[in-house]
Every structure is written in C-alpha cells, then in structure tokens.
Amino acid sequence: AGVFELQIHSFGPGPGPGAPRSPCSARLPCRLFFRVCLKPGLSEEAAESPCALGAALSARGPVYTEQPGAPAPDLPLPDGLLQVPFRDAWPGTFSFIIETWREELGDQIGGPAWSLLARVAGRRRLAAGGPWARDIQRAGAWELRFSYRARCEPPAVGTACTRLCRPRSAPSRCGPGLRPCAPLEDECEAPLVCRAGCSPEHGFCEQPGECRCLEGWTGPLCTVPVSTSSCLSPRGPSSATTGCLVPGPGPCDGNPCANGGSCSETPRSFECTCPRGFYGLRCEVSGVTCADGPCFNGGLCVGGADPDSAYICHCPPGFQGSNCEKRVDRCSLQPCRNGGLCLDLGHALRCRCRAGFAGPRCEHDLDDCAGRACANGGTCVEGGGAHRCSCALGFGGRDCRERADPCAARPCAHGGRCYAHFSGLVCACAPGYMGARCEFPVHPDGASALPAAPPGLRPGDPQRYL
C-alpha cells in the first residue's frame, strides 16, 4: 500500500506566440482546480480500465479576476498535494491524466459552472520510494509544470511497496531468515502477512493477503484436503474407485471476487470481502460517488449519492469510457452530411460542405426542389445537391422564366430563314432545300431525296418544327 503524490507548480501560458486569453474576467471571476487519474501499465490497453489505480481532485484555488489588458499570467493554484492512495503493489509503470478545470463564479443559474481548460496525459516509469520527478506538459497554448512521486505507507517498503518492515525486536540483528530493511537499516523485513485464516501448516503466501496451498490441500484457506480417506468431505461426486467423496469445484475456485476482493466460503455459497472503493456481490461495483466528481471532460454524473449506489457518467459526444476519459475520433462518426469534409479541430468540429449544401453539418440542401417552383409549366428535377428545371417548350433559364428564342441557335440549314412560332420554330427554306430544318437538298428533276414530301407541302414551303 502507498500514496501517489502530485504537486502542481504552475499553470499558465506556454512559450511562443499565441498566448491564451485569461480564463477569468472581471465580469466572470473564476478559480482553478485539478484532477488526476492514474492507470497501471504503459500499454494503450490500460486506457480501458479508467483510473484503476485511483483518482483525486484538488481543492479549489484562490478566486482570480483578470486585470484588463494584461496578458494571462500563471494562474493562482490550489494549496497542497493531490494524493492518490493505492491499496496493492505499486505497478512501477503507470499512465496519468491531469486535467485543469475552471470554476466560474458569476451569477450562474444552479450554482457555479465548470469547464475543462486543459488536459495532459502521459506514460511513465516510477519506482516507489524514489525522489520527486519533475515534468512539464503542454496542452494547446497552456503549460502545466508539476512533480510527482510514489511513496509506500508503513509497514510497506520497496520499489513496489510489497515488502513489509517492522522495528527490530533485538538491537543487533533481525530474526531467522529475515533481512534488514534497506534503506531503513534499523528495521527488519517482516514475514509476509497472508490472508486472514490461511492455514499455517498447509498454506503459504508470496504476496500479502494471498493464501496458496501446499500439495494435497485446497480451499481458500488451504484447510480442505484434496482427498479424504474418512470420506467426510462435505461436497463433490462420489469416487467409484475409492468410494470416497472427492471435493468438486468450490464456490471460491477461480476467485469470483473482482477488483482484488478476497473470497471466503459460506455454508451455501461464497462471500467477497471488497477493497475500499468497491462493493457488490463480487466487488464488481466501484464505491466512488458523484461527490468525488468521477466524470471527466464535462461528463454528467448520475446516481451515486452514497457509496452503496453506483454512479454513471453520461459522456458528451466526443468522449467515451466509463469515466468519459477517452476522446473519440469525432470524424469517424462521419457527422458531415451529403459528402461534406470533416475537420476535428479539438475544441470544435467543422464541416466543409459541398456546393449546394450548408449548415453546421451540411444538413441543409440549398438546391433541393422543396419550395422551389419552375415557372411556365417546367418541372423540378432534384439530385446530388443540385436542382434543375426541365422547361416546357419555348422557355429556358434556371427557373424557366426566360422565353426561349428558338431561332438563337440558327437551326435552319442551307440559308433557310427562321421564324419563332408559339409552339416552336418554323424554317422557310432557300430554293433547292426542304425538310423541317431545310436539311434535305431537292434533286434537279424536282424529286426529293426523301421518299416524298408530306401531302400538301411543296418543296421549298416553310415547315414548322415541333
């Protein structure tokens, strides 16, 4: 057992251009507080077990009001250390998240408002009992300077706080088989304290609190013989060869107690003794409450007014995990509709919309046919962020409002003259040509290259183009 300690030295603008604006103002005074979350191990998988080593919240810092026109200085900090007690061995490698929060003290409806100012994270190796380690982390334009260490709580010592020390019983030497405790030479390494009730004859331990059985013995306290000649074992199927009852699997086999809980058998089942901070039949529920502020990144904590009721963090989109400690790649959700390009700027999500679409998420189809009329009998054709009007004969333009000049394209061939007509155009063909657009030459003998002119039409007569 031991304590991880974090000392915040300063929080303020980092070096370089683009100094951040002060988070507080005369109109909106505020104060800072910090939150630390620890997880064992260096691997990314450690993120899946939020704050498994523990978490702590600092006190609130002094109230700060920005001086008008002054650059943001280092902000006043809360007094004291942040302390995260750990019950078991110190893992040696750990991941941390440190968050800087702002508490606004203006006339807020429903009390002060909290908002996350900065969040830093890292992975480190650290031996318990060592000196303070110094660190600088940057989050955007902010810079956080801090120190940290892990120290063991007596009687534990060592780089993992797993060895136990006791004051010497004799001034000159330690007991048989026990070494002096470095660096506390005036103390002796104590024998390991096994799980309470562990059989001294048939059980032993290599870690505090465990009970491992010698061959031939079983049960959580190594008090049950594996096979009894007296055949009085209280459970298990009958053995056909010996006629004795051989113990079957016990309720504590495989240890059903989660989160470091210890299992003990009861007449009917088993009972878990849970470590501090956990509860439930199998120690599966964390005893942290909403009062501890367990939800990161603006997550809303629900339930958990007392240690006997669980809390749930409702995460804002963009964060997930049981404590809202993990940032989601918001663009992976493809929030930009209609082919828009997604940009996750960290502080905000932006969509760059394709032509014809608008809105924060490109949800507004500017060019759809809804409420858009095509004039003069035209019909609206929609598709892919663009709309067009299919115009009735004689009309054109985007909304079919322009009267089309059917002669503008010079449709009459071979020098034919074009006349606009209410239902289209008429070509008056030059001598020697015929057809709707004067496209066919007339042979010298007066016969058309076509099979025949329509009845009533002489070659050279104007023909209407429909």
């Epitope: 408002a113 804002p316 918001r330 959700l333 929030p335 509709r337 924060p360 949800e363 759809d368």
Partner: antibody, heavy 121, light 107 residues
C-alpha cells in the same frame, strides 16, 4: 437531471398570436441546440424549428416558415417560440427537445412534457 | 423532403415476444436515424441514435440496425413497460422528419 418545461400554450383564434417558452435546467444550456416539435391530436410527431447553441443557426419547417420565430436567451436558460398568424392546423401539443452536443447526430435526446396550443374560433 | 415510412402502424404482442419495427427513408440517410418511445402523459424518450447506438439508461433489449434507406428497431424480449408508440426520425437532411409511428399494444 436534465429538465425541460414548456409553458405559454392556450386557446387562440385563427390569425392570432401566442408565445411559448421552454425553461431548461440540469445541463449547460448554452452548449446545446434546441428543437421545437409538435403533435396534432391523434397524429404523429412533426419537427417545427431548431436553434443552435449560440443562436446563429436557425431552421424552420416549411409549414411554419414566415409565421413562427424561434429564439433563446442563454443567460436565462430559456427558449421561445413566437407563433403569429395561427391556423387551425397549428393545433397541437408543442414540445421542446434538447439536441445532441455538437449536433453530430441531430437527435433530440431529452424532451419536455409539452404545452397544448388550440387554434379555434 | 425525406419521407419516413414506418411499418407496421400498430402491432399486438405479448410480454417476452421479440418485436421488430421497420423504417424506410425515401432516400439514403447515411445511418442518421434515431428511434423514440412515447407513452401517454410521459415525456418522449430517445432510445437509439445513429442507427444502433443505445442512449444512456436505455435497456439493452432495445437494439437498432440498418443502412442506406432501410432501418430496424428490435425489442428482444418485450417487457410490460415497453407497450408504447415508437417513432423513427432522420437526422441527415433538413427538414428533420419522423415516421408515422408504430403502436405496440398488448395482445
């Protein structure tokens, strides 16, 4: 706990006006867009209007465009719907509903109990 | 506007039954489909957003699936408190539109 409470409904004659209010609590109001949705007697839900968290983006259904105005006062945690030129077909229960954070999904994740508007001569 | 067609408009089922409600959009809504539950005299509740994501506090017997234009809400084992009217809503393109609703009644 997120809470939305509508008020301001009542009986009004065709062509008349009404102003609905929605009081919000239990969340940071200025972080969320809000919708108005209505439900005519015995009918389904119909989206009416939307205003973004800062009030910069406003949308209306075609059926109310030009007659209804949505607005908000973040300092008072309040949303409003000014309804003018009311018609019989505007008779409905009007709900305010919170949009999702950052409008990624355009959901309506928490709803009020509604206020009844009756347009009749 | 995108039309949302929900079916069936009503169904009768017993406690423990598996219930499936479908919603069809008139064009691709790229999974921006949400499901709501409405009970008389109670506030409307969001159940599922973005086709398949369960809203906080919603029991895991509710699930959603689909893509393109066709979407489904499934209640794996109907409970007494699930008798209500269910609506789908598309959040892809303005105006936001709802399906006509499906009333789930006790058989």
């Amino acid at each position: 706990e997120v809470q939305l409470v509508e008020s301001g409904g009542g009986l009004v004659q065709p062509g008349g006006s009404l102003r609905l209010s929605c009081a919000a609590s239990g969340f940071t109001f200025s972080d969320y867009g809000i919708h108005w949705v209505r439900q005519a007697p015995g009918k389904g839900l119909e989206w009416v209007a939307y205003i973004s968290s800062g009030g910069y983006t406003i949308y209306y259904a075609d059926t109310v465009k030009g007659r209804f105005t949505i607005s908000r006062d973040n300092a008072k945690n309040s949303l409003y719907l000014q309804m003018n030129s009311l018609r019989a077909e505007d008779t409905a229960v009007y709900y305010c509903a919170r949009g999702d954070y950052e409008d990624i999904f355009y959901t309506m994740d928490y709803w009020g109990q509604g206020t009844t508007v009756t347009v009749s001569s | 506007d995108i039309q949302m067609t929900q079916s069936p408009s009503s169904l009768s089922a017993s406690v423990g039954d598996r219930v499936t409600i479908t919603c069809r959009a008139s064009r691709d809504i790229t999974k921006f489909l949400n499901w709501y539950q409405q009970k008389p005299g109670k506030a409307v509740k969001l159940l599922i957003y973005y086709t398949s994501r369960l809203h906080s506090g919603v029991p895991s017997r509710f699930s959603g699936s689909g893509s393109g234009t066709d979407y489904t809400l499934t209640i794996s084992s109907l409970q007494p408190e699930d008798f209500a009217t269910y609506y789908c809503q598309q959040g892809n393109t303005l105006p936001w539109t709802f399906g006509g609703g499906t009333k789930v009644e006790i058989k």
